[in-house]
Interface confidence: low
Amino acid sequence: QLTTESMPFNVAEGKEVLLLVHNLPQQLFGYSWYKGERVDGNRQIVGYAIGTQQATPGPANSGRETIYPNASLLIQNVTQNDTGFYTLQVIKSDLVNEEATGQFHVYPELPKPSISSNNSNPVEDKDAVAFTCEPETQDTTYLWWINNQSLPVSPRLQLSNGNRTLTLLSVTRNDTGPYECEIQNPVSANRSDPVTLNVTYGPDTPTISPSDTYYRPGANLSLSCYAASNPPAQYSWLINGTFQQSTQELFIPNITVNNSGSYTCHANNSVTGCNRTTVKTIIVTELSPVVAKPQIKASKTTVTGDKDSVNLTCSTNDTGISIRWFFKNQSLPSSERMKLSQGNTTLSINPVKREDAGTYWCEVFNPISKNQSDPIMLNVNYNALPQENGLSPG
């Protein structure tokens, strides 16, 4: 059976297409190509006579067509108007005609698209933004990309107008993009330049850093305030409710206890008209807000009961602290044999008795913090009693 095949089926505008013929019969007079799905002399493109090997152009010939002896038809520099059906009529020697119809589709080479927006400076949680991919073209698929990824499923994202328009409902600061639109057809694809949104937002609740609350007298107090905001926030500082300065950073050298108090950072966004504050408590004190873990040492950890004495020492680098001792969860000293010395840093047990065996630890503390050492184990042994007569039992 006579058939035709388009190579390629989808053709880019300006390119060429070859209408191939398969199963061409023997003993032919000639053949003729027509535009359309039927034989119509008014739409004849070209006729070819085998005997004379002569091609005769028809009414529908544009000068871009070439017919080959094998009946294939080459059309060059195709336009979108060339899209459609083409019919080949073969005139056999027995004057019986055969026909075959094929088709192809011409698509334009797509231009680089661009994105238009109805609002490039939206306000967070308030405005919606509609992006439109230009130009509008037929037989084109519109795709959208956010941050180089295809659109996520989200109730805030809506596509309309044949996917040519992307609407962001109630934009957030995370919707800055970049946004790209891509147009596709079977023969080409092109992507726009990225577009970003300048989302106005904030300020958020400011953060004051560093997070330290406690400072030693004589230190420099350097506080920095930051609030997420677009455009960037304007900052001001208040100390105990009194305005100090309009800067993002506050520096007070050589602080004293009088600098203790509440430090307020005020952040303002002149575009959104919003402002937020954060208050940080600063406490200037000689006391260490975090007492380091003390170390506990024993003059010996295995002693002989009723004979040996032992000294336990609690070591710390912190100043302005107190020390207390514990044994089996009981506060020490608990007997006259236990003595504390050197500001409670040393616990002496003299003499050691069986009931002194067990776990000891010390704790260092000041009015705002405390820490305790790892436990230390004291073992108490008793020597075996000597035989009265010095002889082994018989």
Partner: antibody, heavy 121, light 106 residues
Framework: EVQLLESGGGLVQPGGSLRLSCAAS????????MSWVRQAPGKGLEWVAT????????YYPDSVKGRFTISRDNSKNTLYLQMNSLKAEDTAMYYC??????????????WGQGTLVTVSS | EIVLTQSPATLSLSPGERATLSCRAN?????MYWYQQKPGQAPRPWIY???NRATGVPARFSGSGSGTDYTLTISSLEPEDFAVYYC?????????FGQGTKLEIK
């Protein structure tokens, strides 16, 4: 200026229930922890309940635990106190209070004017 | 729970005098807070974080203390200072209040 307006107080019999409301305005309600504090006639202040800013966490003293429930609707800027199995000793002025700063919320920085709850037969 | 004991229960002084109100805890607390309450009114925050005056509180008021002993001092009493003052802690749960000190005109 921060505004806290309590409502819902009244006379109720022992064993009865009452729901107090506190309408908040002039501040970002969802940023702040909120509490109820009560004061029996001629007596001192007693903490009743606290709820975190997002409403996830709640705290009660033993005296009301299991009987009172604090809740909030951040979309309506409203704090609630559901009081069940009321006793005579629950008679008091109930104050709605907003906590202090975000970084140190352990005090009651703003108070409403209170709503009086009387439990009596 | 931490119990706060305020003393004296009533303090009778004249305007211009110095007032010292005490709040003692049965266990060490990190900070103390003070509230002022006048008859028929809600409490008002007065001192926070032991020594910081709340908004609108005059400079004649000062707070101090540490550990278990805290003090609210009024350097020179004005007529509007006569009220009940409560201390409050929240170092550990539950938060507790003192029973109050009534400052009255002598």
């Amino acid at each position: 200026e921060v505004q806290l307006l309590e409502s819902g107080g009244g006379l109720v019999q022992p064993g009865g229930s009452l729901r107090l409301s506190c309408a908040a305005s002039e501040f970002t309600f969802s940023d702040h922890a909120m509490s109820w504090v009560r004061q029996a006639p001629g007596k001192g202040l007693e903490w009743v309940a606290t709820i975190s800013s997002g409403g996830t966490y709640t705290y009660y003293p033993d005296s009301v635990k299991g009987r009172f429930t604090i809740s909030r609707d951040n979309s309506k800027n409203t704090l609630y106190l559901q009081m069940n199995s009321l006793k005579a000793e629950d008679t008091a002025m109930y104050y709605c209070a907003r906590h202090g700063f975000d970084y140190f919320p352990y005090w009651f920085a703003h108070w409403g004017q209170g709503t009086l709850v009387t439990v009596s037969s | 729970e931490i119990v706060l004991t305020q003393s004296p229960a009533t303090l009778s002084l004249s305007p211009g005098e110095r007032a010292t109100l005490s709040c003692r805890a049965n266990s060490a607390v990190s900070y103390m807070y003070w509230y002022q309450q006048k008859p028929g009114q809600a409490p008002r925050p007065w001192i926070y974080l032991t020594s910081n005056r709340a908004t609108g509180v005059p400079a004649r008021f000062s707070g101090s203390g540490s550990g278990t002993d805290y003090t609210l001092t009024i350097s020179s009493l004005e007529p509007e200072d006569f009220a009940v003052y409560y201390c409050q802690q929240w170092t550990s749960n539950p938060p507790t209040f003192g029973q109050g000190t009534k400052l009255e005109i002598k």
